[in-house]
């Protein structure tokens, strides 16, 4: 069920217990570029938002360009994904406890709006990678992720033949692709215009209520 392994009682307006997150969400006027939609209420700091826009940022030493230069149209989705991960205070219903050296909690099965996943896949399927799960299996001996020996660089489409394969497989099911569309109030938007407020607040409220009913 949705609430299996759910230890938290506070599901709304919360920050995850992870590497760079604030312990409490709040305004951050100077959030950088693609993270700016969260400036009214964020779990990330301005410096985190700045750092995550860099190639091989110090946050995780993760190199998007592990198979040659990632297309800018593709990279922007990974930056947005990282903004959502670091900054969103509206993912409480999907927080799970984990036993990892670098974080105590993670997101699991966040219902990502189907168009956000589709567009991510469309913009990335001709960029190159060497792995279908980016959480594990890298060669970290240099301090930066490199393709493990024998893992061939191929198009994203080779490793992620469908949008769901990308969005769900990439980060070990942090996301699941929702059947709902953007603006429905039933799925999390990676992209939104903050002038209209943060649509993910309503989504979190809906799923938090559903969890309390179960």
């Amino acid at each position: 069920t949705m609430c299996s392994a759910q230890d938290r009682t506070d599901l709304l307006n919360v920050c995850m217990d992870a590497k760079h997150h604030k312990t409490k969400p709040g305004p951050e006027d100077k959030l950088h570029d693609q993270c700016s939609p969260w400036k009214k209420n964020a779990c990330c700091t301005a410096s985190t938002s700045q750092e995550l826009h860099k190639d091989t940022s110090r946050l995780y030493n993760f190199n998007w360009d592990h198979c040659g230069k990632m297309e800018p149209a593709c990279k922007r989705h990974f930056i947005q994904d990282t903004c959502l991960y670091e900054c969103s205070p509206n993912l409480g219903p999907w927080i799970q406890q984990v036993n990892q050296s670098w974080r105590k909690e993670r997101f699991l099965d966040v219902p990502l709006c189907k168009e956000d996943c589709q567009r991510w896949w469309e913009d990335c399927h001709t960029s190159h990678t060497c792995k279908s799960n980016w959480h594990r299996g890298w060669d970290w001996t240099s301090g930066v992720n490199k393709c493990p020996a024998g893992a061939l660089c191929r198009t994203f489409e080779s490793y992620f033949p469908t949008p769901a394969a990308l969005c769900e497989g990439l980060w070990s099911h942090s996301y699941k692709v929702s059947n709902y569309s953007r603006g429905s109030g039933r799925c999390i938007q990676m992209w939104f215009d903050s002038a209209q407020g943060n649509p993910n607040e309503e989504v979190a409220r809906f799923y938090a209520a559903a969890m309390h009913v179960n």
Partner: antibody, heavy 118, light 106 residues
Framework: EVQLVQSGAEVKKPGASVKVSCKAS????????MHWVRQAPGQRLEWMGW????????KYSQKFQGRVTITRDTSASTAYMELSSLRSEDTAVYYC???????????WGQGTLVTVSS | ELTQDPAVSVALGQTVRITCQGD??????ANWYQQKPGQAPVLVIY???NRPSGIPDRFSGSSSGNTASLTITGAQAADEADYYC???????????FGGGTKLTVL
Amino acid sequence: EVQLVQSGAEVKKPGASVKVSCKASGYTFTSYAMHWVRQAPGQRLEWMGWINAGNGNTKYSQKFQGRVTITRDTSASTAYMELSSLRSEDTAVYYCARDISYGSFDYWGQGTLVTVSS
Amino acid sequence: ELTQDPAVSVALGQTVRITCQGDSLRSNYANWYQQKPGQAPVLVIYGQNNRPSGIPDRFSGSSSGNTASLTITGAQAADEADYYCDSRVSTGNHVVFGGGTKLTVL
């Protein structure tokens, strides 16, 4: 800029062997598979086999199994294709090609003409 | 084995479709190459209708069942060439090429 530069033309006698080289530059050599494809005069392209440049694993076409050997030297970013027991019908242009998606070859060498004649 | 029509012609500016048939295409995408005399092949379409950079958008690919198609919309004189399809053969990760189609632009 990705480039694949092949060795020069060869003339061989029937029964001999030939070894064609393909030097890669402009990308991480060990991250991609390299395939070999040949084309006899006026004929179709014919796939011969491939090598995983990272770990050296190879796959060969049934037609060439036992006669072809594909190797690589990672320090020189170079792939090699050796064909033995040559016969006149092996006269062809031999190409190396980088694989980006199970048979999608985005960069090709300029080709090496191998002529087998007594 | 992949089967192609040996020759196809098209009037300048018109649309032409080149087909490729074979069992491997039921479970694998076709890739398409353009080859001009004395030159190495050039990848024009791969995977699910992807064009490498530098390939004009008049080239497109599609597939249905065991048949893949390359469509050139508004053929130009520069498109006159041989066109080859290829496909992965899932068993053994082998690759097979079609026999090629000679395109003439009239």
